[in-house]
Interface confidence: low
Amino acid sequence: LPKAPVITTPLETVDALVEEVATFMCAVESYPQPEISWTRNKILIKLFDTRYSIRENGQLLTILSVEDSDDGIYCCTANNGVGGAVESCGALQVKMKPKITRPPINVKIIEGLKAVLPCTTMGNPKPSVSWIKGDSPLRENSRIAVLESGSLRIHNVQKEDAGQYRCVAKNSLGTAYSKVVKLEVEVFARILRAPESHNVTFGSFVTLHCTATGIPVPTITWIENGNAVSSGSIQESVKDRVIDSRLQLFITKPGLYTCIATNKHGEKFSTAKAAATISIAEWSKPQKDNKGYCAQYRGEVCNAVLAKDALVFLNTSYADPEEAQELLVHTAWNELKVVSPVCRPAAEALLCNHIFQECSPGVVPTPIPICREYCLAVKELFCAKEWLVMEEKTHRGLYRSEMHLLSVPECSKLPSMHWDPTACARLPHLDYNKENLKTFPPMTSSKPSVDIPNLPSSSSSSFSVSPTYSMT
C-alpha cells in the first residue's frame, strides 16, 4: 500500500573539522520510494555539486572536504506524492584548530612610545591568545596588555621590553604558535657624564671626558668654539651601550668645548649636547688691557630678544668672544630644557641679556648687568617652578658642567634699579603694564601672587616700574 514518507532518523548537529568529511543521515520510510532533496541555509544543494556526495537514494549527504564557510543549517526534504513532504534539519558546526592569520612582525620602537605586535587568529571555538617573551609566558600589567584582537600592546615602551616574542593561539582542538619576532627598543642619545670645565695655566694638557648612551650606541663629536676640533687627540671606547670619549688638548687659548652625542632612528637623528669651558689663569688677549669690548650683536639665538642694533659686551677671556658667547647661550638654553610657555620668553630674555650684557662704551668698555628686579620677576613670577628644579639639580650636583652658573644670574648679586637707575639694564621683553601690579611676590613665594603678565613678542616694549613699587 502507498505510504507517506516518514523520517525515521532526524538530522542531528554535526561537528566537523576543516578539511575533514562531514555526513548527514536522513533515513526515510515510504512507499513508493521518495525523492529526497537537500538544502543548506534554505538554498538547494545541486546533485552535480562536486563538493558533496549524495548516496543511498539521497539519504546520505556527505561534504567531502569541510570548509570554514560550510557552517549552517542543513535540511533534507522527502516527498513521494503520498501525503505531504516531510523535512528534518540539523546544524553543521565547523570546528577549526587555531590558525594565526596575521602573525607578529619585527618591530623597532623608540623608548617611551607605544608598540603593538599584531596576532590575529581564526578558529572554532575562538582561540585564546597568549604571548611568550623569550622562554616565559608574558605577564600583563598596567603597561602591557593583550587586546581583544590578540595583538600585544605595550604602552610607554621600556628598554627591558626588548626581546623575542611569539604569540600562542589555543582552543580545545589544538595550539598554534607564531614565528619568533624581535622587539627592538631604541633610545635617544643621552649624555651620562658631561665634560667638566677647567681653569688651567697656559700650555697645560687637559683631558675632557664625555660619556653617552643610547640605542643604537651614539657617536660622539667634539666642537671647539662652534667649529670641529682642530687639534687634540680623541680616544673612544664602547661597552654595554655606553660610549666613552676623551679629548686631550694642549691649551694655548681659552675655549668652549661641546660634546655632541648623536644616534639615528630610521631617517631621524637625536642629539644631546654638553659643554665645558677651558679658561686660562691670568689670561689676557694680546694688545688688550681690558676684559672685553663693545660691538653690535650679530648672532642668531638672541636676535628676537636683544634690542635692534644693541651694543653688547664681548668678553675677551674667550678666544672668539662672539662665537663662544653665542654657544654659551645656546648650550644654556638646552640645559634649561623644558619650560612652560609663560616662562620661555622671559627666560630667553634673561639669558640673552645676561650673557650678552648691554655695553657702555668708553676708554674702558663696561658691561651693564641686568637690574635685580627683572631677574626676580623671571625667577619668582614667570619661572618659579623651573627655577626650583634647576636650583635643586645644582644642589644635588646633577649639573656636571658649570655652564648654567655662567648663564643664569644670581638675582641677589645684581644691582637694584632703585639704587642707581643707570647702573643696571632693563629687559625689553618684560612689559609690566598691568594696572593692578603693585608688588612682586616675596622671595619665599612658590607661586605668583599677582597676575602673570602677557609676554609681548615685540622687542620694543619697555619694563615700566615706578619707584614706588616695593621689592623683597
Partner: antibody
Framework: EVQLVESGGGLVQPGGSLRLSCAAS????????IHWVRQAPGKGLEWVAS????????SYADSVKGRFTISADTSKNTAYLQMNSLRAEDTAVYYC??????????????????????WGQGTLVTVSS | DIQMTQSPSSLSASVGDRVTITCRAS??????VAWYQQKPGKAPKLLIY???SLYSGVPSRFSGSRSGTDFTLTISSLQPEDFATYYC?????????FGQGTKVEIK
C-alpha cells in the same frame, strides 16, 4: 587672535553618524594637542578624545571608544571628530579645546599638562528619533 | 581610569568670602591638574594649570595647591563675577578626567 571654531553639529537619529570640525587659528597648531570635551544638558564636563597634532597619537574615553575617531589635518589647522553609531546619551554640546605640548628629547610632551587654554564656543549634537 | 572626586558639589557664599574647592585623585597624578571656571551657556575658562600655576590674565585671588593626591582651588576674596561652576581636571594619564563640578552660588 586665538580662535577655535566648531561646526558640524545637529540633529541625528540613533545609530547615525556626524562629523564635527574644529578650525584653529592664531596659534601654532603643530605644537598643540586638540581635545574634544562634551557637556550633556545640565551635566558636567566629560572628556571625549584627544590628538597630538605633531605626533598624531590619539586617546579616547571608554564611553566612545570604537565609535568615535579623532583626527587632525595640520595643513588645514583643523581637527575632526567622526561620530558613528550615535546614541541618545551622546546628546551634548561638544567643545574643542587646545593645550600646549612641547618637543623635548625627541618626543612631544605635556598634552593637557598645561591645561586646555583655548576653547571653542561649542556645537550642539542632538541624538533623537 | 583615574577618578577625580570633587567636593563640595555646591556651596553658597557671599562677596568677600574665602572659598575652597577640593579634588581628590584616585591615584597619583603628579601635578598634572588644571582648574576651570564655567558660566551658563559659555565655554570653560582655564584658571590654574600644573596644580598651582596661575594662567595668564587670571586674577591673583585664584590660587591652586597640591598635597599628595589632594588638589585645592582657593578664591581668597569672592567677587560678584566669580559665581560660576568650577571643574578640576587631571591629565596625568592619556585618559583625561574631569571632576563632577562645584557650583558656587550667592548666599
Amino acid at each position: 587672535e586665538v580662535q577655535l571654531v566648531e561646526s558640524g553639529g545637529g540633529l541625528v537619529q540613533p545609530g547615525g553618524s556626524l562629523r564635527l570640525s574644529c578650525a584653529a587659528s592664531g596659534f601654532t597648531f603643530y605644537s598643540s594637542s586638540i581635545h574634544w570635551v562634551r557637556q550633556a544638558p545640565g551635566k558636567g564636563l566629560e572628556w571625549v578624545a584627544s590628538i597630538s597634532s605633531s605626533s598624531g597619537s590619539t586617546s579616547y574615553a571608554d564611553s566612545v571608544k570604537g565609535r568615535f575617531t579623532i583626527s587632525a589635518d595640520t595643513s588645514k589647522n583643523t581637527a575632526y571628530l567622526q561620530m558613528n553609531s550615535l546614541r541618545a546619551e551622546d546628546t551634548a554640546v561638544y567643545y574643542c579645546a587646545r593645550s600646549y605640548t612641547m618637543f623635548y628629547y625627541g618626543g612631544w610632551y605635556g598634552s593637557g599638562y598645561f591645561g586646555m587654554d583655548y576653547w571653542g564656543q561649542g556645537t550642539l549634537v542632538t541624538v533623537s528619533s | 581610569d583615574i577618578q577625580m572626586t570633587q567636593s563640595p558639589s555646591s556651596l553658597s557664599a557671599s562677596v568677600g568670602d574665602r572659598v575652597t574647592i577640593t579634588c581628590r585623585a584616585s591615584q597619583s597624578v603628579s601635578s598634572a591638574v588644571a582648574w576651570y571656571q564655567q558660566k551658563p551657556g559659555k565655554a570653560p575658562k582655564l584658571l590654574i594649570y600644573s596644580a598651582s600655576s596661575l594662567y595668564s590674565g587670571v586674577p591673583s585671588r585664584f590660587s591652586g595647591s597640591r598635597s599628595g593626591t589632594d588638589f585645592t582651588l582657593t578664591i581668597s576674596s569672592l567677587q560678584p563675577e566669580d559665581f560660576a561652576t568650577y571643574y578640576c581636571q587631571q591629565s596625568s594619564s592619556s585618559l583625561i578626567t574631569f571632576g563632577q563640578g562645584t557650583k558656587v552660588e550667592i548666599k
